[in-house]
Structure formats: structure tokens, C-alpha cells
Amino acid sequence: EPPTACREKQYLINSQCCSLCQPGQKLVSDCTEFTETECLPCGESEFLDTWNRETHCHQHKYCDPNLGLRVQQKGTSETDTICTCEEGWHCTSEACESCVLHRSCSPGFGVKQIATGVSDTICEPCPVGFFSNVSSAFEKCHPWTSCETKDLVVQQAGTNKTDVVCGPQDRLR
């Protein structure tokens, strides 16, 4: 694709190439044959993040605490505010417009990956030899107790939800 009539950081208007406004500024008036493009800084709580010819700046995102949101990074004239979720909650989408409580892993499942502000808890079923007997957003699957190392024997087999029960070895009379 050949280049267009106006260079990078310019735009074509009324048969001439005008300079775009830099990030953080909005367009007030197009250039003319005799004048440069006129730009103005965005106001408080506004931003534009690209070279542009916008006549209005965008409003910074509001991190609504009623939706479980808090400010992760305050917006500038060139960047939007970045929201994240309160502790124990995570974003419902990439845009992080609302939050939901982290999911807990049920008994029989352990935490594979602890939730973050932007991702939910990832659970995994406890494999043979491991168990989880609680509903938790933090607990991994625990290995069954090794009766042998305690000089004990398995009296009750473990499951994915219960540990083995160890007992004393039967003494030969």
C-alpha cells in the first residue's frame, strides 16, 4: 500500500495536511494555509491516548467502589484510569467494569492457581494420593498421610476428600 498524501502524525483536510494533536490534547481548529492546527490540553479527569483530531477528550474511567472496584493506576491526560478489584474479588472482563467474589474450590478439588485482581481461582481435581476436605480459595490438594513413615498402617483408605486413617500394626501374638 503506497503512503497517503499526508505524512505520519498529519491528517488531510480541505486539500492540505494538518498536524494531528499530540496525546493529551484535543483539536480546537484545523490548520489553514496560513495557520497551524490549534490544540488544547485535556481537562482534569480527561484523556486522549493517541495522536488525534478529536474535538472532545474522553472521560477517565470511574472505578466504582459499589461494584467492588478500586483505582490501580490513576489516569493522566494521556492515559485512562486502570481499575482493579478489592481484595478477594476479580474483574468480570478485560475492561474490568465490575467485580465478582473469587470462587472457592470445593472438597475434592484444590487450588491450581490463586485468583488475582483480573483472574478467578483455577481449581483442579485432587489426583490419587491427594485430598482436599475444605472449600477454599487458597488451599491446594494435600498429599495423603504416609502411614509407613510413622510406622503405622492404613486403616482406612483415603479419597479425594479425605485423608487416609492410620493405625497401629497388628502385633503377632
Partner: antibody, heavy 116, light 107 residues
Framework: QVQMLQSGTELVRPGTSVKVSCKAS????????IEWVKQRPGQGLEWIGV????????NYNEKFKGKAILTADKSSSTAYMHLTSLTSDDSAVYFC?????????WGQGTLVTVST | DIQMTQTTSSLSASLGQRVTISCRAS??????LNWYQQKPNGTVRLLIS???RLHSGVPSRFSGSGSGTDYSLTISNLEQEDIATYFC?????????FGGGTKLEIK
């Protein structure tokens, strides 16, 4: 004073091509865009495309993509429009004009007649 | 594409009369509206750019106004040399488009 001097009348055969020239004077050639316009007999004006003589960047009307090729030669301050695969629909007067807050200065027009 | 409409294709007026030619765009063109005069011999010149800016060398009897989608060219005191066809053109959005023209004749 600013002048846009176009090449003379062309009588050409269908299927051939033609190159119309537009020599600019009286201003800095690379400082302004050059626009091209078509006018069929007794009709209105139709925009073909625009070229930046400074570095050869172009924008075309979709309708003229593949029909018109715009170029410019800085050394001679001349813009060119190459019209290809001519048909009777291409018979028209073609104008070049210097940009800058509208089509500020126009050439006198070049009549292209496509006929057997 | 933006459509430019000059509803009056021809207009007859007397010398000395005030004449207004109108032009409508199919969408807002933010005052990027130019007016051209094409004489019977085919020569074209810019009269007014950006709605109301008089081009150098154009007599002050020509003026332009308008906003949004509706624009007009006014000749305050018609002279013989003003006999021509007048075209409006939008420079807001590619492709640039012209009105169909208004041919001005003397009564």
C-alpha cells in the same frame, strides 16, 4: 503569481493510455498538495485523487483506482496523471489544481478524447 | 461518500441584483465548504474557502455563509462578468465531492 500549466489536447485510441502533465510555478512545489479533477462534457466535477509532491504520497477516489496513476517530479515542478486502458467513458477535460484551503489554483484543463 | 446537492441547476438574474446560490451536504461537513466559479470558456477559480474566507483577488461582492449541512454563496451586486457556473465542494471527508453546479444567467 501561482500558475498551473497543463499539457495540450490528446486524441487517443481505446485501450491505450495517456499521460497528462501539470507544471506548477510561482510557489514552492513541495509545499502544497496537487489535486486532479475530471469533467465530462456538460457535466459536473469529479475528484480523481491527490498527491503530495514532497514525497509522492497519494489518495485516490476508489472509482479511479486502477484507472489513474498520480506522480510528481520535484526537479521540474511537474505533476503527472497517467490514465490507463482508456475507453469512451474517459473522454473528458482533466484539471489539476493546487491545494491549500480548497483547490486554490486551477490549471486550464486538458481535453482527452478517446476515439477510434 | 458525502453527497453535495445544489438544488437550483440554473438561475436567471438581473444585473445589480443580489443572488444567493445554495448547497446542501448529506452530513455535517464542519464548515469545510468551498465555492468555485467556472467561466463559459472552461476556466475554474476558487472564490471562497472554508465557508466564508474570500480567496485572494476575488471581489468583495462575493460572500459565503453556512454551517453543518447547509451553505450558501451570495453575490451582492451581480455584474456581467459573474455569468458562470458555480460549484460547491466539501473538503471534510475523502473522497472530496462537488455539487452539480448552478448556472447563472442574465435576465
Amino acid at each position: 503569481q501561482v500558475q498551473m500549466l497543463q499539457s495540450g489536447t490528446e486524441l487517443v485510441r481505446p485501450g491505450t493510455s495517456v499521460k497528462v502533465s501539470c507544471k506548477a510555478s510561482g510557489y514552492g512545489f513541495t509545499n502544497y498538495l496537487i489535486e486532479w479533477v475530471k469533467q465530462r462534457p456538460g457535466q459536473g466535477l469529479e475528484w480523481i485523487g491527490v498527491i503530495n509532491p514532497g514525497y509522492g504520497g497519494v489518495n485516490y477516489n476508489e472509482k479511479f483506482k486502477g484507472k489513474a496513476i498520480l506522480t510528481a517530479d520535484k526537479s521540474s515542478s511537474t505533476a503527472y496523471m497517467h490514465l490507463t486502458s482508456l475507453t469512451s467513458d474517459d473522454s473528458a477535460v482533466y484539471f489539476c489544481a493546487r491545494g491549500g484551503s480548497g483547490f486554490a489554483f486551477w490549471g486550464q484543463g486538458t481535453l482527452v478524447t478517446v476515439s477510434t | 461518500d458525502i453527497q453535495m446537492t445544489q438544488t437550483t441547476s440554473s438561475l436567471s438574474a438581473s444585473l445589480g441584483q443580489r443572488v444567493t446560490i445554495s448547497c446542501r451536504a448529506s452530513q455535517d461537513i464542519s464548515n469545510h465548504l468551498n465555492w468555485y466559479q467556472q467561466k463559459p470558456n472552461g476556466t475554474v477559480r476558487l472564490l471562497i474557502s472554508s465557508t466564508s474566507r474570500l480567496h485572494s483577488g476575488v471581489p468583495s461582492r462575493f460572500s459565503g455563509s453556512g454551517s453543518g449541512t447547509d451553505y450558501s454563496l451570495t453575490i451582492s451586486n451581480l455584474e456581467q462578468e459573474d455569468i458562470a457556473t458555480y460549484f460547491c465542494q466539501q473538503g471534510n471527508t475523502l473522497p472530496w465531492t462537488f455539487g452539480g453546479g448552478t448556472k447563472l444567467e442574465i435576465k
